[in-house]
């Protein structure tokens, strides 16, 4: 049987709600893109663009998809195998040690300077010293240049402890 | 460590209503099922139904369908219970129980509130 | 739904002394997937229930070894090797192979 909700299934409104697909877990486990019912003796399909399910598992529910913030762009849309993929929009990136927001980019480096690494949507721009070369990660900036974004890695999906 | 600190003991008159709260601190809130039980005066447990913080939805055992509403306040980790149009055979202890997301391990709880007692007398 | 019956339902012991109840299921409670979910609760006097053992052998974190869980099926026994004064209270067993999960009547043990 199929593991996805096809687009059939998804509209018109007018018609009634498909169904969830099933079928039976495999030595207790069901595949991506499913959980296991509250009897344990089916698998049920996530919802394509609501939830997913990214292993085998016997969760009684699917994960929720992940909603891209405002700042962020959508790279790839949540299907019931995989999140969403959401990345920081030109111009801003998000640290590691504060995931939850994405930050602007610094417009230039400090006098004295100089910029050896581009404003991405995971690092702020890199500047070192002119003559010793070392970095720096000083916060206020004087403008002196702009910097772009290029498009980069995606923002791993949240972990259900929250 | 793992706490789940129940409400005190009620009593009520037949028709009325109750909500019970159990606050769960010492793990994440929305990580595990919390599921309700009854105890009736020397009688044995029923498992009456379980929330899931995570997502929103219960799951109800069909005869208390009707007679238990679960809900939860995620700010503030408590789940609660309400049992409305309360008849003489509703007084019993009443006990919050947490389970995991997972059927293999979902079936069983781990930690216990300490018990509500709600006493419905005229 | 599935009964759950214990026996005996009142259980004087010894304290050094072994003892084990009986716990029994209308159906069977092995599930489609091999695993058989019954489960073991201690209600000390006062207290809430306090899992002892799971999925009929696996003692909970922190139990002690003298607690032990064996069986199949529909027959199950949990047998304490050595009672201890503060093993006194009402145990109960419990399925979750079946929806909804359901309890046993509980078995009260206390020191003669």
């Known amino acids: 049987e199929s593991a996805l909700i096809t687009q059939q299934d998804l509209a018109p409104q007018q018609r009634a709600a498909p169904q969830q697909k099933r079928s039976s877990p495999s030595e207790g486990l069901c595949p991506p893109g499913h959980h296991i019912s509250e009897d344990g003796r089916d698998c049920i399909s996530c919802k394509y663009g609501q939830d997913y399910s990214t292993h085998w598992n016997d969760l009684l529910f699917c994960l929720r998809c992940t909603r891209c913030d405002s700042g962020e762009v959508e790279l790839s849309p949540c299907t019931t195998t995989r999140n969403t993929v959401c990345q920081c929009e030109e111009g801003t990136f998000r640290e590691e040690d504060s995931p939850e927001m994405c930050r602007k980019c610094r417009t230039g480096c400090p006098r004295g300077m100089v910029k050896v690494g581009d404003c991405t949507p995971w690092s702020d721009i890199e500047c070192v010293h002119k003559e010793s070369g070392t970095k720096h990660s000083g916060e206020v900036p004087a403008v002196e240049e702009t910097v772009t974004s290029s498009p980069g890695t995606p923002a791993s999906p949240c972990s259900l402890s929250g | 460590q793992v706490q789940l600190v129940q409400s005190g003991a009620e009593v009520k008159k037949p028709g009325a209503s109750v909500k019970v709260s159990c606050k769960a601190s010492g793990y994440s809130f929305i990580g595990y099922f919390m599921n309700w039980m009854k105890q009736s005066p020397g009688k044995s447990l029923e498992w009456i139904g379980r929330f899931n913080p995570y997502n929103g939805d219960t799951f109800y055992n069909q005869k208390f369908k009707g007679k238990a509403t679960l809900t939860v306040d995620k700010s503030t980790s408590t789940a609660y219970m309400e049992l409305s149009s309360l008849r003489s055979e509703d007084t019993a202890v009443y006990f919050c129980g947490r389970s995991a997301y997972y059927f293999d391990s979902g079936g069983y709880f781990d930690y216990w509130g300490q018990g509500t007692l709600v006493t419905v007398s005229s | 739904d599935i009964v759950m019956t214990q026996s005996p339902l009142s259980l004087p012991v010894t304290p050094g002394e072994p003892a084990s109840i009986s716990c029994r299921s209308s159906?069977?409670?092995?599930?489609?997937?091999?695993?058989?979910?019954l489960h073991w609760y201690l209600q000390k006097p006062g207290q809430s229930p306090q899992l002892l053992i799971y999925?009929?052998?696996n003692r909970f974190s922190g139990v002690p070894d003298r607690f032990s869980g064996s069986g199949s099926g529909t027959d199950f026994t949990l047998k304490i090797s050595r009672v201890e004064a503060e093993d006194v209270g009402v145990y109960y067993c419990?399925?979750?192979?079946?929806?909804?999960?359901?309890f046993g009547p509980g078995t009260k043990v206390e020191i003669k």
């Open positions: 419990s399925q979750s192979t079946h929806v909804p999960w359901t």
């Open positions: 999925k009929v052998s």
């Open positions: 159906q069977s409670l092995v599930h489609s997937n091999g695993n058989t979910y």
